[in-house]
Interface confidence: low
C-alpha cells in the first residue's frame, strides 16, 4: 500500500525518498515515476540521477535536497488537481531485483478560499484565492487570481448557496460580511 | 533574449577559492536553465555546472569532486560558481550560458545564450 501526501492547489508537493549512499559521491542511480513502480525501471519518468549526477528532469520537478547524501526527496511546483496520483521513488541498488521501490500517493486538495475585506459601500463581493505555499524556507502568500464578482442579483442566491457549505463556516469563522447599501 | 556578464576571474594560488558571477540582462531570468562551463588549454569546452529554474544541480563530477557549488539568486538575475581548493588544471576561461530548455539532460542542453568568459588562473 502507497504513503499518502497532501498539497493544496499552487502550493508545492514534497515526496520525501532517502538512501544511504555506501560512501559519499558512491551514488545509486534513482528514478521517479508517475504511477506505481512497475517490475523494472519507472514509468513516465520525471526526474533520474545515475551514478554522479541528476541526467534527466522535467520542468516542474526538482531535488531540493542534496541527493549527493541520499537525498532524492521530490518537489513538485504548484501543483494542480491533475497531480494527484501514485509517484514512484525506485533506488536502483545494483543486483538482479535489488532495487528499492517506494509507491507514494499525492492527494492534490483545492485551495482554500479566503475572503477580502470589502468597502461598505461596495456592490462587488470578490473573494481572491489566497494560499501559503509551506516549505524550507519562509512561507509565501501569492494571490492566484479572483473568483467572478458577484454582482447584486446573484447575493441571495449566494447567501442561499453558502449557507450549509464549508465556504459559509470559513467566511464566518474569519468574520467577513457582505453588506449591502 | 537574454544578455551574460561574467566577472570574478583573476589570479590565485594553488588551493585557493574563487567565486564567479553571472549577471542576466532581462526580467526573465528565473526561466533559464543557467550554467557553467570552461575551456582549459588545450582541452574542448567542457561542462562544469548547471542549476535549473527550480534549483535542481548538476556537477560534473569527473573533476568538480565536491569542490565547486552553483547557485541563482533570482531577484538579482545572477548565477553564481563557487570555486574551492583550486589546482593548476583548473586554469581556463569560465563562461556561463542559459537555455529555455525545461526538461531533459542538464549537461547536454540546448544552450542557446553565452557569456564572453571569465579567465580564472591558477598558480602552483
Known amino acids: 500500500s502507497e504513503v499518502e501526501y497532501r498539497a493544496e492547489v499552487g502550493q508545492n508537493a514534497y515526496l520525501p525518498c532517502f538512501y544511504t549512499p555506501a560512501a559519499p559521491g558512491n551514488l545509486v542511480p534513482v528514478c521517479w515515476g508517475k504511477g506505481a513502480c512497475p517490475v523494472f525501471e519507472c514509468g513516465n519518468v520525471v526526474l533520474r540521477t545515475d551514478e554522479r549526477d541528476v541526467n534527466y528532469w522535467t520542468s516542474r520537478y526538482w531535488l531540493n535536497g542534496d541527493f549527493r547524501k541520499g537525498d532524492v526527496s521530490l518537489t513538485i511546483e504548484n501543483v494542480t488537481l491533475a497531480d494527484s496520483g501514485i509517484y514512484c521513488c525506485r533506488i536502483q541498488i545494483p543486483g538482479i531485483m535489488n532495487d528499492e521501490k517506494f509507491n507514494l500517493k499525492l492527494v492534490i486538495k483545492p485551495a482554500k478560499v479566503t475572503p477580502a475585506p470589502t468597502r461598505q459601500r461596495d456592490f462587488t463581493a470578490a473573494f481572491p484565492r489566497m494560499l501559503t505555499t509551506r516549505g524550507h524556507g519562509p512561507a509565501e502568500t501569492q494571490t492566484l487570481g479572483s473568483l467572478p464578482d458577484i454582482n447584486l442579483t446573484q447575493i441571495s442566491t449566494l447567501a442561499n448557496e453558502l449557507r450549509d457549505s464549508r465556504l459559509a463556516n470559513d467566511l464566518r469563522d474569519s468574520g467577513a460580511t457582505i453588506r449591502i447599501g | 533574449q537574454v544578455q551574460l556578464q561574467e566577472s570574478g576571474g583573476g589570479l590565485v594560488q594553488a588551493g585557493g577559492s574563487l567565486s564567479l558571477s553571472c549577471a542576466a540582462s532581462?526580467?526573465?531570468?528565473?526561466?533559464?536553465?543557467m550554467a557553467w562551463f570552461r575551456q582549459t588549454p588545450g582541452k574542448e569546452r567542457e561542462f562544469v555546472a548547471a542549476?535549473?529554474?527550480?534549483?535542481?544541480?548538476?556537477l560534473n563530477e569527473d573533476f568538480v569532486k565536491g569542490r565547486f557549488t552553483i547557485s541563482r539568486d533570482n531577484a538579482k538575475n545572477t548565477v553564481y560558481l563557487q570555486m574551492n581548493d583550486l589546482k593548476t588544471d583548473d586554469t581556463g576561461v569560465y563562461s556561463c550560458?542559459?537555455?529555455?530548455?525545461?526538461?531533459?539532460?542538464?549537461?547536454?542542453?540546448?544552450?542557446?545564450?553565452w557569456g564572453q568568459g571569465t579567465q580564472v588562473t591558477v598558480s602552483s
Open positions: 532581462g526580467r526573465t531570468f528565473k526561466n533559464y536553465l
Open positions: 542549476i535549473t529554474q527550480l534549483g535542481t544541480r548538476s
Open positions: 550560458a542559459a537555455s529555455l530548455q525545461s526538461g531533459g539532460s542538464l549537461r547536454y542542453a540546448k544552450y542557446d545564450y
